[in-house]
């Protein structure tokens, strides 16, 4: 169930000036749908800098097979993994390890999934006669989003990774089927 590198494509996401990052989606651990809901925007930009090149949020492309029980998708699916830091580069740790994240009292920004898409996959099952299909929730884009101190770290867990059949849920359901819940819904569907 490991991730397989597909290519080293990395798209850098640069927040537009004047457009403030949003809080991360909240994960519903409800078997079927993990709906991502975006919260309100902060009243002001937390950084003094206007140099957008100091922000770095990359979309890494990976491929994986979707599995469900003993079944596996006929073809691998490609999705994005969000990577990188969202913040002025000058405030991030440097190679020597000096410096810190930005001021502790300030808001935290993370590179996390922004939009999702659903993709239907055909599953090949040993001994199976009927064609089986599932819909998987794949990350379609990443964004720097504001994480307030009230957000729990656990909310950032596994963003962008669809467990092998995550708990049943929405179209998404790769096999980790016990987690059916990961099936999170596709936010962009609404």
């Amino acid at each position: 169930q490991g991730w397989q590198a597909f290519k080293n494509d990395a798209t850098e996401i640069i927040p537009e000036l004047g457009e403030y990052p949003e809080p991360p989606p909240e994960l519903e651990n409800n078997k079927t749908m993990n709906r991502a809901e975006n919260g309100g925007r902060p009243p002001h930009h937390p950084f003094e800098t206007k140099d957008v090149s100091e922000y770095s949020c990359r979309e890494l492309h990976f491929t994986r097979y979707v599995t469900d029980g003993p079944c596996r998708s006929a073809k691998p699916v490609t999705e994005l993994v969000c990577s990188g830091q969202c913040g002025p580069a000058r405030l991030l740790p440097n190679a020597i390890g000096r410096g810190k994240w930005w001021r502790p009292s300030g808001p935290d920004f993370r590179c996390i999934p922004d939009r999702y898409r659903a993709q239907r996959v055909q599953l090949l099952c040993p001994g199976g006669e009927a064609p089986r299909a599932r819909k998987v929730r794949l990350v379609a884009s990443c964004k720097c989003k504001r994480l307030t101190r009230f957000h729990n770290q656990s909310e950032l867990k596994d963003f962008g990774t669809e467990a092998a059949r995550p708990q049943k849920g929405r179209k998404p359901r790769p096999r980790a089927r016990s987690a059916k819940a990961n099936q999170a819904e596709l936010e962009n569907a609404y």
Epitope: A118, E129, K135, R170, K180, L186, A189
Partner: antibody, heavy 118, light 107 residues
Framework: EVQLQQSVAELVRPGASVKLSCTAS????????MHWVKQRPDQGLEWIGW????????EYASKFQGKATMTADTSSNTAYLQLSSLTSEDTAVYYC???????????WGLGTTLTVSS | DIVMTQSHKFMSTSVGDRVSITCKAS??????VAWYQQKPGQSPKLLIY???TRHTGVPDRFTGSGSGTDYTLTISDVQSEDLADYFC?????????FGGGTKLEIK
Amino acid sequence: EVQLQQSVAELVRPGASVKLSCTASGFNIKSTFMHWVKQRPDQGLEWIGWIDPENGDTEYASKFQGKATMTADTSSNTAYLQLSSLTSEDTAVYYCTTGESNYDFDFWGLGTTLTVSS
Amino acid sequence: DIVMTQSHKFMSTSVGDRVSITCKASQDVSTAVAWYQQKPGQSPKLLIYWASTRHTGVPDRFTGSGSGTDYTLTISDVQSEDLADYFCQQYSNYPWTFGGGTKLEIK
């Protein structure tokens, strides 16, 4: 919160048709498969079929071909089951249920009780 | 069509006991089996899929097992709220079919 809302009951004359609805909230039906299941009083469950609302693909149990027609309206996030040429054998509770696969059912509506009677 | 047979229409047990509900398929269904619980006046709820994988939020006292044609749902430490009908379902071959159900009664 995931919810599937169905009308509580329908009373229909023999020979007529009826269209049952299932409106989803908390998720987009395009990201799932919608299934319909029949349960007659004090009896077991019968799978009618599934529809992929995203593209209209359907699969029916042979028993229900010609009897049932599944459709979906993604703009209203609603799935429909139309039953035709109704007889007393069609009197049952009809459930809509959904999952990210075309083979098992994660969430269920409360069911619509269909009574066919003159 | 594949016939799913639940030989016991009724089973009686006591709180704290362990009970096993069986389901036999008319042909090999390759673990493509789910179990549902239906309480009186409610819609069914998924408990187990792929024969042994517990659905999210289902108490670990519910365990599924089996392969080939024989499948079992075991409830250990039965609770009063487990009073319900239990149905097995196969999704190996179309049409997906259900067992006739087993009603669990609490003494």
